[in-house]
């Protein structure tokens, strides 16, 4: 992005860039490869305590590893700023022997005009500033140092970037005179990465760009322009990679249409058009490109970024995403579910699964949920028989096998993972859902008739009679 | 110290009006939400009016919408609930409250009793 | 409007036990959820704020969990200064109701 030499202040200077990648110099630990699960694939949970069991004994060895918690460190160049003007931050904890960086962009939805910032900043004000944060934070999901917790990337350099710009991670406006907030997401997560350069983020194999939701779609627009600034500050040998979590939304018409009073009823399209102005948002430059000036608020939907993106990214989606559902005017109260309702929600899984259809490495279960990568219980969660974490692990293997994303998929290891079934929660492997009346655990079959669904109708296309299906989702199979 | 003092309540007969103060010191009031908040004898609490730092978006609860209504005169760092049509199921403890994160200080309360 | 539904009602403890107070909202409100305790004839106190963030000078014994539309706070061996009412808060568009709160008695 031009301008970007304003950020660095004198001083400031990242390390330059090493003088070779080829091997670790005498003495730096090497770094540990993926580890290969096809072999245990049938006695997984043996494997699992004898890694358990042997991190554990080597836990003695590493008194860092003791500690679970990421630190915080407000940015050294104060000029970029969270919306009230205090430094943004981000939450490290390394690792010494890896050459792996987990870099996490936490969501948060956004506002848009001064009025829903106001009321953000009343509420949720630890999204807007940083002058509460805690010195700490627990890593949990992916951002896990446990591996039982943690199977995919437990040794990884963690990096949780909490969003406190409220712009998708896209806005680059300070605060001044005219403007009550800053917006500097897309700016913040430049800083923060020529600040983790100086903290070893220079010998870095590969750079992970993870985020959830709000975080998820940050990903999408800014994995590129990581790329592009490692490159630029003499890194190119560190691959950068993007993991968008529950951040691919759809354009879609609403359900019920609202006009655009608040964050909550405003309809997506409307809500970005919105916020890329009052944020002074950018997105990628290959979309950019694509479309007229004005018209950049498309880059923000993953189906139309996705194409134009040259960092491989993963995609994990619930195909009934409940913030997508939400922006959608649809609001599951636990009353009986219309018909109406009920097809307009099948439709949305529907179009959703279309979108995934050409992107090699994505993960959709047929959910209704919200968010994944972080949740402790991020690993049971299955598509086809396979969890995130495997997905993951088969993807960085068909990314070591071809520093593209190889098209032939590797036997036994599969990355393209998009439930085909219909309906929400036909998935067994789905997170519990309650009664929002008596808060009881609903098994799959009790949800989908509280959901409205004729089971009739929801057997014949499976060529099962009603009784059969019933008995299987209640088995969970 | 954040200190927020209501005052203004005591016994209105049905129909009629009042107005609640609230007194905020120890903080930059306007860079604060500020919320009105009522507890009737014996029961739960119940959110009623909101006003916004900065632009002073206001937002009501239903039953108390047409009725009430919130200001702030921030040069006096006050806060104030102008009640009409008051009706005995309005009998409440009213408090007045800062947010940032949740309602984080809350004053003593001001009691308001609507009864002929 | 979001509806919370906050159980138990009413709880019997003794000092020293752990204790789970829970709240539903009757949609998805994305951690955006406040706890406060209430003792006798005294004004509410905030005690976590989005859901897990303990607010200023409060016990570690007490601890908030949850996301979408289950919340719950946990306290942790109970002090004799713990007993009151308790309520829960969502802030997820208004209005920003509250649940019905949770009397906690020494048994």
């Known amino acids: 992005s031009e301008g970007r030499k304003t950020w660095r202040r004198r001083g400031q200077q990242p390390p330059p860039p090493p003088r070779t990648e080829a091997a670790p110099a005498a003495g730096q630990p090497v770094e540990s490869f993926p580890l290969d699960f096809t072999a245990v694939e049938g006695n997984m949970d043996s494997f699992m305590a004898q890694v358990k069991s042997l991190a554990q004994s080597l836990y003695p060895c590493s008194a860092q590893q003791l500690n679970e918690d990421l630190r915080l460190h407000l940015l050294l160049n104060t000029s970029v700023t969270c919306n009230d003007g205090s430094p943004a931050g981000y939450y490290l904890k390394e690792s010494r022997g890896s050459r792996r960086w987990l870099l996490f962009l936490e969501g948060g939805w956004y506002c848009f005009n001064r009025e829903n910032c106001d009321s953000r900043y009343d509420t949720m004000r630890r999204l807007m500033s940083s002058r509460d944060w805690p010195r700490t934070r627990t890593g949990t999901g992916i951002l896990s140092s446990q591996p039982e917790e943690n199977p995919y990337w437990w040794n990884a350099n963690m990096v949780f970037i909490p969003y406190c710009s409220s712009d998708v991670w896209s806005g680059a406006s300070s605060k001044s005179e005219k403007n009550e907030y800053a917006f500097m997401g897309a700016l913040i997560i430049q800083e923060v990465v020529r600040e983790l350069l100086g903290r070893g983020l220079s010998g870095a194999k590969v750079l992970l760009l993870a985020g959830s939701s709000a975080g998820g779609t940050g990903v999408l627009l800014n994995v590129d322009r990581v790329a592009e600034q490692l490159e630029k500050l003499g890194y190119p040998a560190i691959q950068v990679r993007g993991l968008a979590d529950s951040g691919w939304f759809l354009d879609n018409k609403q359900y019920r249409h609202t006009d655009c009073v608040d964050t909550i009823t405003c309809a997506p399209t409307e809500a970005i058009r919105r916020g890329i102005r009052y944020w002074n948002g950018v997105v990628p430059e290959r979309c950019r490109r694509q479309f007229q000036e004005g018209e950049e608020w498309n880059c923000f939907f993953g189906y139309k970024v996705y194409p134009t993106l040259r960092c491989p990214v993963f995609v994990v989606q619930w195909l009934f995403d409940e913030a997508q559902l939400t922006v959608d005017n649809v609001h599951l109260t636990g009353q009986p579910v219309q018909e109406g309702l009920r097809l307009y929600i099948q439709n949305l899984g529907r179009e959703l699964r279309h979108t995934l259809k050409d992107v090699p490495a994505s993960f959709a279960p047929a959910c209704l949920s919200h968010e994944i990568i972080i949740r402790s219980h991020w690993t049971d969660v299955q598509v086809k028989g396979t969890s995130l974490p495997r997905a993951l692990h088969c993807w960085d293997r068909s990314l070591h096998d071809s520093h593209k994303a190889s098209k032939t998929p590797l036997k036994g290891c599969p990355v393209h993972l998009v439930d085909s079934c219909p309906w929400p929660h036909c998935n067994p492997s789905c997170p519990t859902v309650r009664d929002q009346f008596t808060g009881q655990e609903m098994n799959v079959a009790q949800f989908l008739m509280h959901m409205g669904f004729d089971m009739q109708t929801v057997a014949q296309p499976q060529g099962l009679e009603p009784s059969e299906l019933l008995g299987m989702l209640s088995n969970g199979s | 110290d954040v200190q927020l003092v209501e005052s203004g309540g005591g016994l209105v007969q049905p129909g009629g009006s009042r107005k609640l103060s609230c007194a905020a010191s120890?903080?930059?009031?306007?860079?604060?939400?500020m919320h009105w908040v009522r507890q009737a004898p014996e029961k739960g609490l119940e959110w009623v009016a909101y006003i916004t730092s900065g632009s002073g978006a206001i937002y009501y609860a239903d039953t108390v919408r047409g009725r009430f209504t919130i200001s702030r005169d921030t040069p006096k760092n006050t806060l104030f609930l102008q009640m009409t049509s008051l009706r005995s199921e309005d009998t409440a403890m009213y408090y007045c409250a800062r947010s940032a994160d949740g309602l984080d200080y809350w004053g003593q309360g001001t009691s308001v009793t609507v009864s002929s | 409007d979001i509806q919370m539904t906050q159980s138990p009602a009413s709880l019997y403890v003794s000092v020293g036990e752990t204790v789970t107070i829970t709240c539903r909202a009757s949609?998805?409100?994305?951690?955006?959820l406040a706890w406060y305790q209430q003792k006798q004839g005294k004004s509410p106190q905030l005690l976590v704020y989005?859901?897990?963030n303990l607010a200023d000078g409060v016990p570690s014994r007490f601890s908030g969990s949850g996301s979408g539309t289950q919340y719950s706070l946990k306290i942790n061996s109970l002090k004799s200064e713990d007993f009151g009412s308790y309520y829960c808060?969502?802030?997820?568009?208004?209005?920003?109701?509250f649940g019905s709160g949770t009397k906690l008695e020494i048994k």
């Open positions: 808060q969502h802030f997820w568009g208004t209005p920003f109701t």
């Open positions: 120890g903080f930059t009031f306007s860079s604060f939400g």
């Open positions: 989005g859901a897990t």
């Open positions: 949609e998805n409100i994305y951690s955006n």
